[in-house]
């Protein structure tokens, strides 16, 4: 016979029940009734044995990160709770989830705080006048880095080649520009935009298309057309790794990029 | 050796305040959580009031909560009970025990009490 | 709050016999994550403060003698004291933690014909 409701504990994780779409942050409170004079405080997941895998831990007034940077743990103000919070979700992070402390001498003993449950659903698609979110995952860095200097260079070729054909269709045209259409009117995603990987390429964002955009007719018949490379409208600021973005968003922040959920 | 000594009891009378003490020593008194449990004549025994470590989390049952205090003071390895508005119900022998298993609230070690009776 | 009902109020038996105790609580102490059950039981002997003999229901503290034994889960408890000594004559007292407020039961006195 169980009891239908917790016992009193030590540790406390909550909330018991988390649902997350895939892509979120999905953030547990591990809090302490009183903090002992030496402790670790480790963040577990239940393995399908039901055997505990430590995600992170906290000792010492320092967080120790497990193999996956996703898991963080963080100590906050009052000093006896943490936040213990996955980087965008994923689905099979769903599972059953514990804090537990080690005491240290003098009196070495081991408390584990009920369990909590985290669901992660499948990220349901939304209007495109909704926020964007974070894509599910990518299929490796390597791959986006190829992708997107593949996806660099075929831009830059085509844009060589408009200019080129231009020339060779205006031969007469010799200054001058018209710019056609709205300056403030945003520069429409079809559809059919493929997503953009993260690039450490320094201050600019890329935007990669399957489709380039035809070229805007003349607005007079011996003006030169001059091609023009997009910018998004928000500047990259200084020293700051600039992400290529997507119809589903971009990437969620990595642990060195910046305050975050990471204790500095 | 584990030792914990209580003092303060007395008669006082009903409505009136009465601060218990219990001094430990024997052990690391800042790492343990602490309670006082009463026992009234010749009946069973009640808990009172319990503390954790530093004193930053207190418990109470609702009989004397909002009328009793516990309270610590690590630096002097001392713990109190502070009872205001006392109840001829509240006539007892006073025990200031340890819970050692930290985060547990069973008791390894009991004082051997303190008398308090409240009388007009 | 969870009642603890101890069952006899007392009972006398000759030295060397084994007499058992029983406590009730009104509700499961058993929590299943960890398979503990959050009861424990105390000694206390005339004109003296009470003792920890057994805490997670079965789990004898240090220097208490073997013939005293815990066992049960759930909702039903007993003490067992496989051979009783003079010594023995005491009231045993039930306690949960499994929930504030703490809880005893109202004793079981044990007394050596």
């Known amino acids: 016979l169980d009891s239908p409701d917790r016992p009193w504990s030590p540790l406390t994780f909550s909330p018991a029940q988390l649902t997350v779409q895939e892509g979120e942050n999905a953030t547990f409170t591990c809090s302490l009734a009183d903090i002992p004079d030496s402790f670790v405080l480790n963040w577990y997941r239940l393995s399908p044995r039901n055997q505990t895998d430590k995600l992170a831990a906290f000792q010492e007034d320092r967080i120790e990160p497990g193999r996956d940077r996703r898991f963080r743990v963080t100590r906050l103000p009052n000093g006896r709770d943490f936040h213990m919070s996955i980087v965008a979700a994923r689905l099979n992070d769903s599972g059953i989830y514990l804090c537990g402390a080690i005491y240290l001498p003098p009196n070495t003993q081991i408390n584990e705080s009920p369990r909590a449950e985290l669901s992660v659903t499948e990220r349901t698609l939304e209007p495109p006048t909704q926020s964007p979110s974070p894509p599910p995952r990518l299929s490796g860095q390597l791959q986006g880095l190829v992708i997107g200097v593949t996806s660099v260079l075929v831009g830059v070729l085509l844009l060589l080649l408009l200019t080129w054909v231009l020339a060779a269709v205006f031969p007469r045209a010799t200054r001058g520009a018209c710019v056609c259409g709205s300056e403030d009117e945003p520069l429409k995603e079809g559809p059919d935009a493929a997503p953009v990987f993260t690039l450490d390429y320094g201050e600019l964002d890329f935007q990669w298309r399957e489709k380039t955009p035809e070229p805007p007719a003349p607005c007079a018949p011996e003006q030169t057309e001059y091609a023009t490379i997009v910018f998004p409208g928000r500047p990259a600021s200084p020293g700051r790794r600039a992400s290529a973005s997507s119809l589903q968003g971009a990437q969620p922040p990595s642990p060195e990029d910046g305050p975050g959920l990471w204790p500095p | 050796e584990v030792q914990l000594v209580e003092t303060g009891g007395g008669l006082v009378q009903p409505g009136r305040s009465l601060k218990l003490s219990c001094v430990a020593s024997g052990f690391t008194f800042n790492n343990y959580w602490m309670t006082w449990t009463r026992q009234a004549p010749g009946k069973g025994l009640e808990w009172v009031a319990s503390?954790?470590?530093?004193?930053?989390?207190?418990y109470y049952p609702d009989s004397v909560k909002g009328r009793f205090t516990i309270s610590r003071d690590n630096a002097q390895n001392t713990l109190y009970l502070q009872m205001n508005s006392l109840r001829s119900e509240d006539t007892a022998t006073y025990y200031c025990?340890?819970?050692?298993?930290?985060?547990?609230?069973?008791?390894?070690?009991w004082g051997p009490g303190t008398m308090v009776t409240v009388s007009s | 709050d969870i009642v603890m009902t101890q069952t006899p109020s007392s009972q006398a038996v000759s030295a060397g016999e084994k007499v058992t105790m029983s406590c009730k609580s009104s509700?499961?102490?058993?929590?299943?994550?960890?398979?503990?059950?959050?009861l424990a039981w105390y000694q206390q002997k005339p004109g003296q403060s009470p003792k920890l003999l057994i805490y997670?229901?079965?789990t004898r503290e240090s220097g208490v003698p073997d013939r005293f034994i815990g066992s049960g889960s759930g909702t039903d408890f007993t003490l067992t004291i496989s051979s009783v000594q003079a010594e023995d004559l005491a009231v045993y007292y039930c306690?949960?933690?499994?929930?504030?407020?703490?809880?005893f039961g109202s004793g079981t006195k044990l007394e050596i014909k």
């Open positions: 509700q499961s102490l058993l929590y299943s994550e960890n398979k503990k059950n959050y």
């Open positions: 025990t340890s819970a050692l298993n930290w985060g547990y609230w069973y008791f390894d070690f």
């Open positions: 306690q949960q933690y499994y929930n504030f407020p703490l809880t």
């Open positions: 503390i954790t470590n530093s004193g930053v989390s207190t």
């Open positions: 997670w229901a079965s």
